[in-house]
């Protein structure tokens, strides 16, 4: 039961995380104009990965896409790439994890296959989350560097007649969305990996042990699945795993060197 819950929760958390990564990637507020002492501005600038926008106090908002690839900073291209890789990996991970969910039965898929798929999706979510966190962090670092550079140059021309006020940019909402979403995807991935360990059949060094109960018998052998079918019609609800790991509907517990590796 705990394994199913962990897997399900991992899936949901990752789903929310990936939705957040997609939202952050599409958002225009990666960097917003620093208002420093002036909370009310006549012209407010903000920028995303794909376009930059200007909102006037009149309410008029104009956005312009970056219609060049070669003219864009390499760092921005890198951030775009990291976010897209994160989304793609996350999307594939979601697709894989749907089929890996213990509560969803697809044909005669064995639990070992589901365990492998859970692990695969978990790793994908972890990498996806890391990509998003890395992308957002690279952009944030770029902002911090530019912020202090523009602060240093802010009052250029103060000695002369004309002053040039440079627009400084600070962290936009998308950065925080990206960090949280990346973190959630990462956590979801870890949960999937933990769930995988509970799903996976465990190898043990025990010799075959036979249990006899009221004329029915089941022989357990290391390295194999059910050896005999003494339980008749009941066996369809029961899979007997090596190493003593048990399914939800098993009543008896069998000796095991360890429950989880």
């Amino acid at each position: 039961m705990a394994v199913t819950a962990c897997q399900g929760l991992g899936f949901v958390v990752s789903l929310i995380g990936i939705a957040g990564i997609i939202a952050a990637t599409c958002m225009d507020q990666w960097s917003t104009q620093d208002l420093y002492n002036n909370p009310v501005t006549a012209v407010f600038n903000y920028q995303g990965l794909w376009r930059s926008c200007v909102r006037e106090s009149s309410g008029f908002t104009e956005c312009r896409g970056y219609f060049t690839l070669l003219g864009l900073p390499a760092m921005l291209q890198a951030v775009r790439a990291l976010m897209i890789v994160g989304i793609v990996l996350g999307a594939i991970g979601l697709l894989v994890s749907i089929f890996a969910l213990k509560c969803i039965r697809i044909g005669s898929m064995e639990d070992s296959a589901k365990a492998n798929m859970t692990l695969t999706s978990g790793i994908m979510f972890i990498v996806s989350g890391l990509c998003a966190i890395a992308g957002v962090s690279v952009f944030a670092n770029m902002l911090v560097t530019n912020f202090w550079m523009s602060t240093a140059n802010m009052y250029t021309g103060m000695g002369g007649m004309v002053q040039t006020v440079q627009t400084r940019y600070t962290f936009g909402a998308a950065l925080f969305v990206g960090w949280v979403a990346g973190g959630l995807t990462l956590i979801g991935g870890v949960m999937m990996c933990i769930a995988c360990r509970g799903l996976a059949p465990e190898e043990t060094n025990y010799k075959a042990v036979s249990y006899h109960a009221s004329g029915h018998s089941v022989a357990y052998k290391p390295g194999g699945f059910k050896a005999s079918t003494g339980f008749g019609s009941n066996t369809k609800n029961k899979k007997i795993y090596d190493g003593g790991a048990r399914t939800e509907d098993e009543v008896q517990s069998y000796p095991s060197k360890h429950d989880y590796v």
Epitope: N38, T41, V43, C53, S58, E62, Q163, V165, T167
Partner: antibody, heavy 118, light 113 residues
């Protein structure tokens, strides 16, 4: 047709207060910032402050802070500008104006003449 | 605050001739985000409120005759009336629309020679 109709001329004594109204019609009142600009005789136009009819948020010119108060009556689509502690140099024509694209004023009231004299 | 300075203070031009009014700001009015200059031009006739002519330094307001044109960038701007008409006699103001508080030039009085 967009119209901004202001209240009539006022004569006040120094130290008194004046409240000028600006009734808007012909557009959605809550969608545009309302600004107040004054023009003293032979002087340049001087921006006083602004109010958003939807949120009620205001922004004032530091020069007038503490003396000017902008208010609204949404139901009547009317904006008000109150200037207190009047001085002789406050003698001017006071305009309300609607802000549009480009942060420009596309429609203005006809102006309200306020004379401060002892 | 941004200081707006217009030149000349008054100008006399013959009918049909070109009139040019200059405006200089103490800070750049060019917004890097959209490469637009936040400068506005108004026309004011005696006893009337100002009338919007041009915004974004060069965009003509609807209904304004095409003999009015605006140009310039950064801190230096120009309003040009290509062929002066009798009804163009007025005071012209430039306005900083970039930062609060909005500020206006002292005005240029245009007359017929």
């Amino acid at each position: 047709e967009v119209q901004l109709v202001q209240s009539g001329a006022e004569v006040k004594k120094p130290g008194a207060s004046v409240k000028v109204s600006c009734k808007a019609s012909g557009y959605t009142f809550t969608s545009y910032w309302m600004h107040w600009v004054r023009q003293a005789p032979g002087q340049r136009l001087e921006w006083m402050g602004m109010i958003h009819p939807n949120s009620g948020s205001t922004n004032y010119n530091e020069k007038f802070k503490g003396r000017v108060t902008l208010t609204l009556d949404k139901s009547a689509s009317t904006a008000y500008m109150e200037l207190s502690s009047l001085r002789s140099e406050d003698t001017a024509v006071y305009y309300c104006a609607r802000l549009k694209t480009g942060n420009s004023f596309d429609y203005w009231g006809q102006g309200t003449t306020v004379t401060v004299s002892s | 605050d941004i200081v707006m300075t217009q030149s000349p203070d008054s100008l006399a031009v013959s009918l049909g001739e070109r009139a040019t009014i200059n405006c200089k700001s103490s800070q750049s009015l060019l917004n890097s985000g959209n490469q637009k200059n936040y400068l506005t031009w108004y026309q004011q006739k005696p006893g009337q409120p100002p009338k919007l002519l041009i915004y974004w330094a060069s965009t003509r307001e609807s209904g304004v005759p095409d003999r009015f044109s605006g140009s310039g960038s950064g801190t230096d701007f120009t309003l040009t009336i290509s062929s002066l008409q009798a009804e163009d006699v007025a005071v012209y103001y430039c306005q900083n629309a970039y930062t609060y508080p909005f500020t206006f030039g002292q005005g240029t009085k245009l007359e017929i020679k």
